[in-house]
Interface confidence: medium
Amino acid sequence: QLPPGKPEIFKCRSPNKETFTCWWRPGTDGGLPTNYSLTYHREGETLMHECPDYITGGPNSCHFGKQYTSMWRTYIMMVNATNQMGSSFSDELYVDVTYIVQPDPPLELAVEVKQPEDRKPYLWIKWSPPTLIDLKTGWFTLLYEIRLKPEKAAEWEIHFAGQQTEFKILSLHPGQKYLVQVRCKPDHGYWSAWSPATFIQIPSDFTMNDEQKLISEEDLGGEQKLISEEDLHHHHHH
């Protein structure tokens, strides 16, 4: 029978900067019942507080509700493991809520094949930001990535959409069924999970593009612009 092993706070996440949750991994239990407590203080303070909610986030977690969450303060926290033989402490973790936001995936993903008479066909993808994120306040800038692949292909093609909530893709394989997904991240935070896949059948007469494409004003929502393959296939490797 031994004192407990050192726990580790391994993850903190916030869906929207208004609440956040941290999770820890217990160390060895020393063969005895072990109690865990998370204590924290805010930067510039020495007064320690105990975790306000050990339930909401599930086992080995601490949830900070709205009244305990401040974007403008940083939190310094640690976990104490105690059994009859003694105690051990995790390393401290510094948490700035701005940096740990992991939004829900974007919503309402819609995919359409557009085949204008006078121009090359293209795939039009549109989505909405996740509901928990309030973009109107200016606290958030969300960036988006799209990935797509033919149903039976192994490799995803990834496009960076910036802050746009719609995107056009021109080079696709005719006759193939494509899976399309989108995800988002705030400036300083983590990528969301990918949205559920939307399937789209590319018609057999969807012609492959020339090396450069002329996209018109209506499509771009701006001035007429010549877009190269490189621009259209802005690949990001992760």
Epitope: T46, F89, Y94, Y99, H188
Partner: antibody
Framework: EVQLLESGGGLVQPGGTLRLSCAAS????????MSWVRQAPGKGLEWVSS????????YYADSVKGRFTISRDNSKNTLFLLMNSLRAEDTAAYYC?????????????WGQGTLVTVSS | DIVMTQSPDSLTVSLGARTTINCQSS????????????LAWYQQKPGLPPKLLIY???TRESGVPDRFSGSGSGTDFTLTISSLQAEDVAIYYC?????????FGQGTKLEIN
């Protein structure tokens, strides 16, 4: 105003012992990790040792492990570095540094340093 | 051990010029638990102890002029001085505090021409 004042440096022969002290004021000493960082004449900075708020958590550079011991007396707001089996390569200015937090996360205040010279 | 490599070793720049110093770590110092890079930048003037400028790779220490900024993530970091002043002549060090032993870059000496 945060102040860190090192003392205890001087000339010592190889194999000798010195004990450095760092008197802290202007902040809640017991709430912050503390460290020793050294700088050989004309050279860069080298981290030596750190001690967290809980005095049992001590860390050492490989070059001093087994020879140097860091400790703190929170009641006297003082940090110590006991240096045994000193070598010529330990010659340096030794700085006492306050960590930004209770663990060792960046050093936001430094003392003026105390010079240790190991020479026969 | 994590090795920190700064470039250049020395730099001579005109007053008012934009200046950048680079720092590379031999392994990532970005922690997935809190999305922070465990990197600090220090300024050391002749005969004085080092002074903390930037921590968490991009957070400016209070009282540090806003012409100093830090950027980068993972293994590649930059200290930028937007408009060099005479009082910025010093040696600049980066330091990782991700893992012990905490290690410093070799320093970059900044001078004015």
């Amino acid at each position: 105003e945060v102040q860190l004042l090192e003392s205890g440096g001087g000339l010592v022969q190889p194999g000798g012992t010195l004990r450095l002290s760092c008197a802290a004021s202007g902040f809640t000493f017991s709430a912050y990790a503390m460290s020793w960082v050294r700088q050989a004449p004309g050279k860069g900075l080298e981290w030596v040792s750190s001690i967290n708020v809980r005095a049992g958590d001590t860390y050492y550079a490989d070059s001093v492990k087994g020879r140097f011991t860091i400790s703190r007396d929170n009641s006297k707001n003082t940090l110590f570095l006991l240096m045994n089996s000193l070598r010529a390569e330990d010659t340096a200015a030794y700085y006492c540094a306050k960590a930004r937090y209770s663990s060792n996360w960046g050093f936001d205040f430094w003392g003026q340093g105390t010079l240790v010279t190991v020479s026969s | 051990d994590i090795v920190m490599t700064q470039s250049p070793d020395s730099l001579t720049v005109s007053l008012g010029a934009r200046t950048t110093i680079n720092c590379q770590s031999s392994q990532t110092i970005l922690h997935s638990s809190n999305n922070h890079n465990y990197l600090a930048w220090y300024q050391q003037k002749p005969g004085l102890p080092p002074k903390l400028l930037i921590y968490w790779s991009s957070t400016r220490e209070s009282g540090v002029p806003d012409r100093f900024s830090g950027s980068g993530s993972g293994t590649d970091f930059t200290l930028t001085i937007s408009s060099l002043q005479a009082e910025d002549v010093a040696i600049y060090y980066c330091q990782q505090y991700s893992n012990t032993p905490y290690t410093f870059g070799q320093g970059t000496k900044l001078e004015i021409n």
